[in-house]
């Protein structure tokens, strides 16, 4: 078997350790194994057998330290983990998530009060009373709050016609309150009478365009913790009641609002004051703020737009969508069912990603099944414990500075696990305070360039031309991202990540991200492209490799040769093709050729009875719906008209 430690010609201790977790470096002064090169880098057992004393071997080990004292977490344990890693090595530990028996519950109703919602708002008058009794079986301490939203109060979202600016819903013959971005009406309270009074006082409002400013309001409700009255210990539910879609970031450019949403609280006297000066949040930003603030969202949607919100769920972890019946009759059932579902799901997410550190998390569910951590476990009860097997890997040792801890957060929980990462990238022999030893293997040094005095080396640069550091004579030296040393590029170390390659033309930070992680955390970035670890594929390593088999048709072709497989789904590159495998291509040449006799059946005017009879027998199996609207191309194309 190949011994990469000995065969890689590592010239220094640090380079040796970077080769792999099995490699060690002998610092012993008199360690000579004979031959032309001093093989200081090798597998530890080989170094010992070659005469290196054990205490002269640099071999940092991997440690996982879980402090047992001062544990304050009750649901997520351990709350802190310290890991010492070396290049190529991985560390393992178990994280336990134990849901509490009964949580306090904070439920904030965020209601779209545009005119089309007036029937649904009437139902809110009675929800508090009934819901508090139904929730009494899931929570010992239940609070309700209320806020309303419409949209940004500028054209073209509202009518600025003088007669309509204060009453947007004259079309409905209703007396409306003026439009507003978001108003926080009632802070969370256990006083149901207060809630019912607040809802009873609520008047309808209105706007012009179909989408509403729901995400603006959601973000404010999530981040304005003290205004809303969110409790640290409570399960936080944000019920968004609407019948329309929501504006997204960039929509507001139409009104000349170009300042990106800063994600902060901007309530003054309970009114969102940046509604007309700051953009709607992006989905990613909204997701981040909801997770940071432990908010579980319940979209209670009436009408056709339910599916719009349902499609957003994968992008907003800890979120549920339910369809409300007319006049919101089933609103409370929806809340109870959503809460049941939310508290019975346990999944985790890695936040504060540390560059160069990779997490692989597997949930071990109470029923014994294993699931990816982001998928987590379902049907978890308060007696259950979910275990997460966490593997932390450090591939390389070229990251400088940056964060030194990551956070594993179970979604919707108010506790996290903080993972401190300590990189063992340097050798003790390089440390001036440590005992001097051979940290550089002098047999590898180019005497023309390197001048070494003990362990300190300097370079004589005059002997080398900088031309050898250019990829092309017109290009800058080392692509403008490094310096030329002895005719070779030494790339700049920058905070964004690693710059590398013969001419510093490559880097590991300009790759696509997926769910906030570079290459989805399942690959490495090289020259702006994700190089996926085994078992993963896709432009951002977001797809399990097994997914590709779902794109293969019965003939063994990927997407029938008319598309590309993206995460197990065919994306048809030929705009004329449709179907799960892009298999239907009514207007493709072969389809017309193969079915020419039947094509005329789709245009049966002026056909003889004999041909019509043939249509019924020979062409009955032809899937007509795929051809009906697209046959004109066959008839009009000269190649078919012989």
């Amino acid at each position: 078997e190949d011994n990469r430690c000995a065969s890689s010609n590592a010239a220094s201790c640090a380079r040796c350790l970077a080769l792999g977790p099995e490699c060690g470096w002998c610092v012993q002064e008199d360690f000579i194994s004979g031959g032309s090169r001093s093989e200081r880098c090798d597998i530890v057992s080989n170094l010992i057998s070659k005469g290196c004393s054990v205490d002269s071997i640099e071999y940092p080990s991997v440690h996982v330290i879980i402090p047992t004292e001062n544990e304050i977490n009750t649901q997520v344990t351990p709350g802190e983990v310290s890991i010492q890693l070396r290049p190529g090595a991985e560390a393992n530990f178990m994280l336990k998530v134990h849901p509490l028996k009964k949580y306090p519950v904070d439920l904030y109703y965020l209601v779209d009060v545009s005119a089309s919602m007036h029937n649904n708002i009437e139902k809110l008058n009675s929800v508090g009373n009934d819901l508090s009794r139904k929730m009494a079986f899931f929570s010992r301490d239940f609070r309700l709050g209320f806020g309303s939203y419409v949209d940004k109060t500028v054209s073209p979202y509202i009518s600025i016609h003088p007669e309509r600016i204060h009453n947007q819903c004259s079309d409905y013959n209703l007396d409306c309150m003026p439009p507003h971005g978001y108003i926080h009406v009632l802070s969370l309270t256990e006083n149901i009478t207060e809630f019912e009074k607040a809802v009873h006082r609520q008047k309808i409002s209105g706007n012009i365009d179909t989408p509403e400013g729901g995400f603006d309001a959601m973000l404010q409700a999530a981040v304005c913790e003290s205004h809303i009255g969110w409790r640290k210990e409570a399960k936080r539910l944000l019920l968004v009641m609407t019948d329309q879609t929501s504006h997204l970031a960039l929509d507001s450019k139409l009104a000349g609002i170009v300042v990106p949403n800063d994600g902060n609280c901007h309530l003054k006297n309970n009114v969102y004051v940046k509604s007309t000066t700051m953009e709607h949040p992006s989905l990613g930003q909204l997701s981040e703020k909801l997770i940071d603030n432990n908010i579980n969202v319940i979209f209670a949607v009436q009408g056709k737009q339910f599916h719009w919100y349902k499609d957003l769920l994968p992008l907003l972890p800890g979120t549920i969508a339910g369809e409300i019946e007319s006049k919101a009759a089933n609103l409370n059932n929806l809340v109870v069912e959503a809460y049941q579902k939310l508290i019975s799901e346990v999944k985790v997410q890695v936040e504060n990603q540390v560059q160069g550190i990779y997490f692989n998390i597997t949930a071990i569910c109470p029923d014994g099944s294993r699931k990816p951590g982001m998928e987590g476990c379902r049907n978890v009860t308060s007696n259950d414990e979910v275990l997460f097997n966490v593997t932390v890997t450090m591939k390389k040792c070229d990251v400088t500075g940056g964060k030194n801890y990551a956070i594993i957060k179970p979604i919707g929980f108010n506790e996290t696990a903080k993972i401190h990462i300590h990189r063992n990238c340097s050798c003790q022999c390089e440390d001036n305070r440590g005992p001097k030893g051979k940290c550089v293997d002098e047999t590898f040094l180019d005497s023309k360039c390197f001048q070494c005095d003990e362990n300190k080396c300097h370079f004589d640069e005059d002997q080398f031309s900088s031309e050898s550091c250019k990829s092309h004579k017109d290009q800058p030296v080392c692509s403008g991202r490094g310096v030329c040393v002895c005719g070779k590029c030494s790339c700049h170390k920058i905070k964004l990540g690693k710059v590398y390659g013969k001419y510093c033309e490559k880097d590991d930070f300009s790759c696509p991200y997926h769910h906030g992680n570079l290459c989805a955390g399942h690959g490495e970035c090289e020259a702006g492209r994700c190089q996926c670890f085994s078992g993963w594929e896709g432009d951002r390593c977001q797809c399990p490799s097994a997914a590709a088999q779902h794109c293969v048709n019965s003939k063994g072709q990927v997407c029938s040769g008319r598309g590309t497989c993206v995460c197990g789904r065919c994306e048809c590159t030929d705009p004329r093709s449709i179907g799960r495998f892009c298999e239907h291509c009514p207007t493709c040449y072969t389809a017309c050729k193969e079915n020419w006799n039947c094509m005329q059946c789709l245009h049966p005017h002026n056909l003889s009875q004999a041909i019509l009879d043939q249509c019924k027998t020979s062409c009955a199996l032809m899937e007509q719906q795929h051809y009906v609207d697209q046959t004109s191309e066959c008839f009009s194309s000269p190649s078919y008209l012989r």
Epitope: R133, A136, F137, T193, Q340
Partner: antibody, heavy 115, light 107 residues
Framework: EVQLQQTGAELMKPGASVKISCKAT????????IEWIKQRPGHGLEWIGH????????NYNEKFKGKAVITADTSSNTSYMQLSSLTSEDSAVYYC????????WGQGTLVTVSS | DIEMTQSPSSLSASLGDRVTISCSAS??????LNWYQQKPDGTVKLLIY???SLHSGVPSRFSGSGSGTDYSLTISNLEPEDIATYYC?????????FGGGTKLEIK
């Protein structure tokens, strides 16, 4: 320890009124709904109504409107149910109960209506 | 009002038996169903809430299931202390209503 202590048995004349009490101890009285339930001898359970002591919201079974009035006094952690215009049909055991996942029932108060 | 029909009204079983009591609602009650146990001395205890959640302190031999309009309580391994009358109660809509009860006796 949670306890709901109800008043002892009551013997009443037809046409009279009776006020049964249910004293709660061992928990925050104002935040739990208190239910009142009737059980006639040899019969099943019948829901009368309930109250949320902290907000004095009440709901009644239509059948008992005009017959029963449920109140609560948060200063003494006690819920009361007054039954008026008593008839023999009102002879029953009346239970108070704390509503919710940690439900707890009182021992019951026997009311006998007899001339 | 939602009518709750319990069956059987009484049943006799041997120790160690598996016993099932049924409860049917006159309309869908979305799992808002509780089961109560009333001992011969009149004391009443909640056994199961929201169709299948076991009240704390209740032995795991008790279980509940069902959906829509049909629900059931199962006692998997009958013990002497299970002699009682069992009631289902819906709390989907006001007024809350109880089933007629099932009196369980030991053979």
């Amino acid at each position: 320890e949670v306890q709901l202590q109800q008043t002892g048995a009551e013997l009443m004349k037809p046409g009279a009124s009776v006020k049964i009490s249910c004293k709660a101890t061992g928990y925050t009285f104002s935040t739990y709904w208190i239910e009142w339930i009737k059980q006639r001898p040899g019969h099943g359970l019948e829901w009368i109504g309930h109250i949320l002591p902290g907000s004095v919201i009440t709901n009644y079974n239509e059948k008992f409107k005009g017959k029963a009035v449920i109140t609560a006094d948060t200063s003494s952690n006690t819920s009361y149910m007054q039954l008026s215009s008593l008839t023999s049909e009102d002879s029953a055991v009346y239970y108070c109960a704390r509503w919710g996942w940690d439900s707890y029932w009182g021992q019951g108060t026997l009311v006998t209506v007899s001339s | 009002d939602i009518e709750m029909t319990q069956s059987p009204s009484s049943l006799s079983a041997s120790l160690g038996d598996r016993v099932t009591i049924s409860c049917s609602a006159s309309q869908g009650i979305s799992n808002y169903l509780n089961w109560y146990q009333q001992k011969p001395d009149g004391t009443v205890k909640l056994l199961i809430y929201y169709t299948s959640s076991l009240h704390s302190g209740v032995p795991s031999r008790f279980s509940g299931s069902g959906s829509g309009t049909d629900y059931s309580l199962t006692i998997s391994n009958l013990e002497p202390e299970d002699i009682a009358t069992y009631y289902c109660q819906q709390y989907s809509d006001l007024p809350y209503t109880f089933g007629g009860g099932t009196k369980l006796e030991i053979k």
